[in-house]
């Protein structure tokens, strides 16, 4: 079976000549919701962490990356049930003995406080109130993110977003 | 360190009223190259397969999914050195005893011919001439893809791309 691939609108470069730029404001796709500068997709179904990562990837998005405590709180405020948990893009790197975001950066000590073991095959999920680690093979809901950017209708070669 | 996140222009919905649609043709972002309906990013650095998957995800893209032999050939033609190898979005599923694309579909027997072991922790890479399996922990270059779509400047609520 051929791999069927989700689509994502990439940055526009209509032609290579210098033109006037007019930004269009964007909203988020169906099923996604806007939170500050991001579109978030809170899954309803469940997956192991790796499959969640792959699902976001095939949607040309990323498992949620949380910049700071404010963003964590904003995201947790959108979780409507205290019994529901969502994988985010953070797991334990055994070789580096540290929590690592999927973009390669490490968790800084004053960011999220993770309850649970920091060991091999530990991945991180958030609930309405807390941040936990769990075996990555556990099936849970997950959150994908797309950055919400401006698309310029006419752009010059050096004006990529 | 905070997670820094790549941007991707998501589908445009300028307002909720019915408006005229005018498609804009798209080109690929800087560093990416257009191959048919896709934008491809050939990495310069190396990573284990899992980190490559995560990197594409944070770029709001996917590890390369190859539809057929023609696409394989087109991609291989862009590899300028026969000694260079690139991870793609295909690995061995031990539980299902089959090669599996990261979007969940299985490799059909008449698609790619993979040289190497089909076993646990085997991931697939391509070179200028062939398709191989290797331990997923091996560090290699990788290829990310974004689907190249049309963005409509003015869209009605039900006309998401």
């Amino acid at each position: 079976q051929k791999p069927s691939i989700g689509k994502c609108s990439v940055d526009i470069q209509q032609n290579r000549t210098k033109t006037t730029e007019r930004p269009d404001l964007l909203n988020c796709p169906i099923y996604w919701q806007q939170v500050q500068e991001k579109c978030l997709l809170f899954s309803h179904t469940v997956n192991p962490w790796n499959n969640s990562l792959a699902d976001c990837s095939t949607k040309e998005s990323s498992l949620l990356l949380i910049q700071d405590k404010d963003e964590l709180t904003r995201t947790q405020n959108l979780i409507h049930d205290k019994a529901i948990s969502f994988w985010i893009g953070l797991n334990f790197s055994l070789s580096e003995k540290n929590w690592k975001w999927i973009n390669g950066s490490f968790l800084s000590s004053n960011d999220l406080k993770i309850t649970g073991d920091a060991k091999e095959n530990s991945c991180v999920y958030i609930s309405q109130t807390s941040v936990y680690s769990e075996y990555c093979s556990t099936e849970m809901k997950w959150i994908c993110q797309k950055e919400l950017t401006l698309v310029r209708n006419k752009v010059s070669p050096d004006s990529w977003l | 360190q905070k997670p820094s996140i790549g941007k991707c222009s998501v589908d445009i919905q300028q307002n909720r009223t019915k408006t005229t649609e005018r498609p804009d043709l798209l080109n690929c972002p800087i560093y990416w190259q257009q191959v048919q309906e896709k934008c491809l990013l050939f990495s310069h650095t190396v990573n284990p397969w899992n980190n490559s998957l995560a990197d594409c995800s944070t770029k709001e893209s996917s590890l390369l999914l190859i539809q057929d032999k023609d696409e394989l050939t087109r991609t291989q033609n862009l590899i300028h050195d026969k000694a260079i190898s690139f991870w793609i979005g295909l690995n061995f599923s031990l539980s299902e005893k089959n090669w599996k694309w990261i979007n969940g579909s299985f490799l059909s027997s008449n698609d790619l011919k993979i040289t190497g072991d089909a076993k646990e922790n085997s991931c697939v890479y391509i070179s200028q001439t062939s398709v191989y399996s290797e331990y997923c922990s091996t560090e290699m270059k990788w290829i990310c893809q974004k689907e190249l779509t049309l963005v409509r400047n003015k869209v009605s609520p039900d006309s998401w791309l």
């Epitope: 079976q1 791999p3 069927s4 169906i30 099923y31 997709l41 899954s43 309803h44 179904t45 469940v46 997956n47 192991p48 499959n51 699902d55 095939t58 949607k59 099936e139 997950w142 994908c144 | 299902e96 599996k100 694309w101 979007n103 969940g104 579909s105 299985f106 609520p157 039900d158």
Partner: antibody, heavy 121, light 107 residues
């Protein structure tokens, strides 16, 4: 062609068992949660059971809990429903259904043609 | 479980008429509501999802609206092929539930 094809229905006595199968083609089966939905003759639609994409999580309607078991084999692109201790009220056309988006349980954009299960003595 | 109450249970209409069907949820479901059309002997067909999004290939005379607990399916200018039974379905929480159906008949 994108399709779902159910099989395994038939006439069975109360207390008996049947195993329904649903063969999927034309889409990435292993990426989607899947459901069984049934419709008794002349009645409305009733969701029966769902299974996650990886197969590790299952849910059931109260009316079938403890009697029916949903499973899947992603390598064969096939969904199953094992029905035990069948009752007259289980008589229905059984549909398998795929959600529109891989993050969702429902919003079923693809349905099989259905297979009729008749429970009667 | 979330109950969905559809009204009316049946409606008689003529070609060209505007038909409105309502679906009320027993608790708030945000915009997680879908509408299906079913013809005798056939599987249901998805018309509307996420309360107001038209499924690909569905004619634009079908539209959906609402959020929270009250939702509406509207068929503008009813066509002969639209005579069928229509169901709403919530996707907010499991178990997934369907409304009882609305039969659109020829007057």
């Amino acid at each position: 062609e994108v399709q779902l094809l159910e099989s395994g229905g038939g006439l069975v006595q109360p207390g008996g068992s049947l195993r329904l199968s649903c063969a999927a083609s034309g889409f990435t089966f292993g990426q989607y949660a899947m459901s069984w939905v049934r419709q008794a003759p002349g009645k409305g639609l009733e969701w029966v059971s769902a299974i996650s994409a990886a197969g590790g999580t299952t849910y059931y309607a109260d009316s079938v809990k403890g009697r029916f078991t949903i499973s899947r084999d992603n390598s064969k692109n096939t969904l199953y429903l094992q029905m035990n201790s069948l009752r007259a009220e289980d008589t229905a056309v059984y549909y398998c259904a795929k959600p529109l988006d891989s993050s969702q349980w429902a919003d079923f954009d693809l349905w099989g043609r259905g297979t009729l299960v008749t429970v009667s003595s | 479980d979330i109950q969905l109450t559809q009204s009316p249970s049946s409606v008689s209409a003529s070609v060209g008429d505007r038909v409105t069907i309502t679906c009320r949820a027993s608790q708030g479901i945000s915009s997680w509501l879908a509408w299906y059309q079913q013809k005798p002997g056939k599987a249901p067909k998805l018309l509307i999802y996420a309360a107001s999004s038209l499924q690909s290939g569905v004619p634009s005379r079908f539209s959906g609206s609402g959020s929270g607990t009250d939702f509406t399916l509207t068929i503008n200018s009813l066509q002969p092929e639209d005579f069928a039974t229509y169901y709403c379905q919530q996707a907010w929480v499991l178990p997934i539930t369907f409304g009882g159906g609305t039969k659109v008949e020829i007057k």
